[in-house]
Amino acid sequence: LQDLCSNCPAGTFCDNNRSQICSPCPPNSFSSAGGQRTCDICRQCKGVFKTRKECSSTSNAECDCISGYHCLGAECSMCEQDCKQGQELTKKGCKDCCFGTFNDQKRGICRPWTNCSLDGKSVLVNGTKERDVVCGPSPADLSPGASSATPPAPAREPGHSPQ
C-alpha cells in the first residue's frame, strides 16, 4: 500500500478514503513533493503582506511586505514598518534620532556618531540624523614631517545610548 502512495506526484495526495488513489489537491492547497497523504493549505498574503507568487497545486504562495514595510524572517514571515533615514521605530511610531545619533537605513535603530577625538582626530564633516561624522586628520597630522600611518578604525564611546 505504501508503494501505491509513493507513486502520487506533487500536486496530488494519497487518498485513504478512495483506496489510496492519487487525488488532486483541493483548491487553495498544494503538495510540493510526491507521496503525500495530505495537501498543505496555501499561505494567504493579507494585511501587511502582498502576493509575490500565487499558490499552485505544487508550490506554496510567496509573500512580500506592502510598501512602507520590510521583510523579516524566512520566506518573509514577518513585516516590520519602515521609517525614514534619520529615524528609528518605536512603539509610538517613527521617532527622529536624538542629537548625536544617526541612522542611514529605513529600518533599524539610531547609533552614536563616531567620536573622532578618541582616535586623536578632528571632525572633518559634522554628523546629521542620517549620516555619521567624517573624521579628518588631527592638526598634528597636518604638520610637516607627520607620519602617514594608516588610521585605526573609528572609535565611539562605549555604552553610549541614543535616548
Epitope: G73, A74, S77, K91, Q105, G108, H160, S161
Partner: antibody
Framework: QVQLVQSGAEVKKPGESLKISCKGS????????ISWVRQMPGKGLEWMGK????????NYSPSFQGQVTISADKSISTAYLQWSSLKASDTAMYYC?????????WGQGTLVTVSS | DIELTQPPSVSVAPGQTARISCSGD??????AHWYQQKPGQAPVVVIY???NRPSGIPERFSGSNSGNTATLTISGTQAEDEADYYC???????????FGGGTKLTVLG
Amino acid sequence: QVQLVQSGAEVKKPGESLKISCKGSGYSFSTYWISWVRQMPGKGLEWMGKIYPGDSYTNYSPSFQGQVTISADKSISTAYLQWSSLKASDTAMYYCARGYGIFDYWGQGTLVTVSS
Amino acid sequence: DIELTQPPSVSVAPGQTARISCSGDNIGDQYAHWYQQKPGQAPVVVIYQDKNRPSGIPERFSGSNSGNTATLTISGTQAEDEADYYCSTYTFVGFTTVFGGGTKLTVLG
C-alpha cells in the same frame, strides 16, 4: 537563503582565551545588527550585546560589559565573541542572532565548555 | 534596565487554553516579542510586536501587551506546543534587549 553558521564546540581550561564566530550569508551582512545570546545549561536566554557590522559599533548588556568582546569583520561577513580569560561559569551555549529587538534568524549555537 | 518576570512553569490539558505572563515595569510602553524553544534547538519567534504572528505559526498563538504585563495565549493547546517560552523587549533607555526568565509549558497527558 539567509543563514548564520557558527563555529564548532570548544573545550577550554579556566584562564584560557577563546574567540568564536558567526558567519552570515544570503543578506547584506553590514546593514543588520548581530546579537549574541548566552544560555547556561538548563537555564534561560540572556542577551549579551550587539554589533552593527557596517561600522563595528557595539553595545553591551551591563551584565556582560567588560567580560567579553564583540567584534566583526564585514569583509568576510563574520561576527565574533571573545574572552581573554575564561571561567568555569562561562560554560554555556552561545547563539548569534540577527537583529536587535526581533531576532529573526539564529545560528545553530556554539557549546563552550570550561573545565579544569 | 527593565526586568521581565515569567512563571517558571505552566501546565495545561490538551485542547485547553494556556496563558503565559511576562511582567515588567511599563512593558506596555515597549514592544514585547515571544520565542519558543524546544530541546536542542535555537529559539523561534512565535509572536512579534505584542500581537503579530509570523506566517507558519499556527493561529492558536496570540499575544497582548499593556500596562505592566505582556501575555502569550495558546488556544487549543497541542502536544507539539510543549516547549520553553521566552518574552523579550528592546528598551530605548538602555539601548539593550532583555529576556524574561522563561516558562516551561507542559501539555498534560
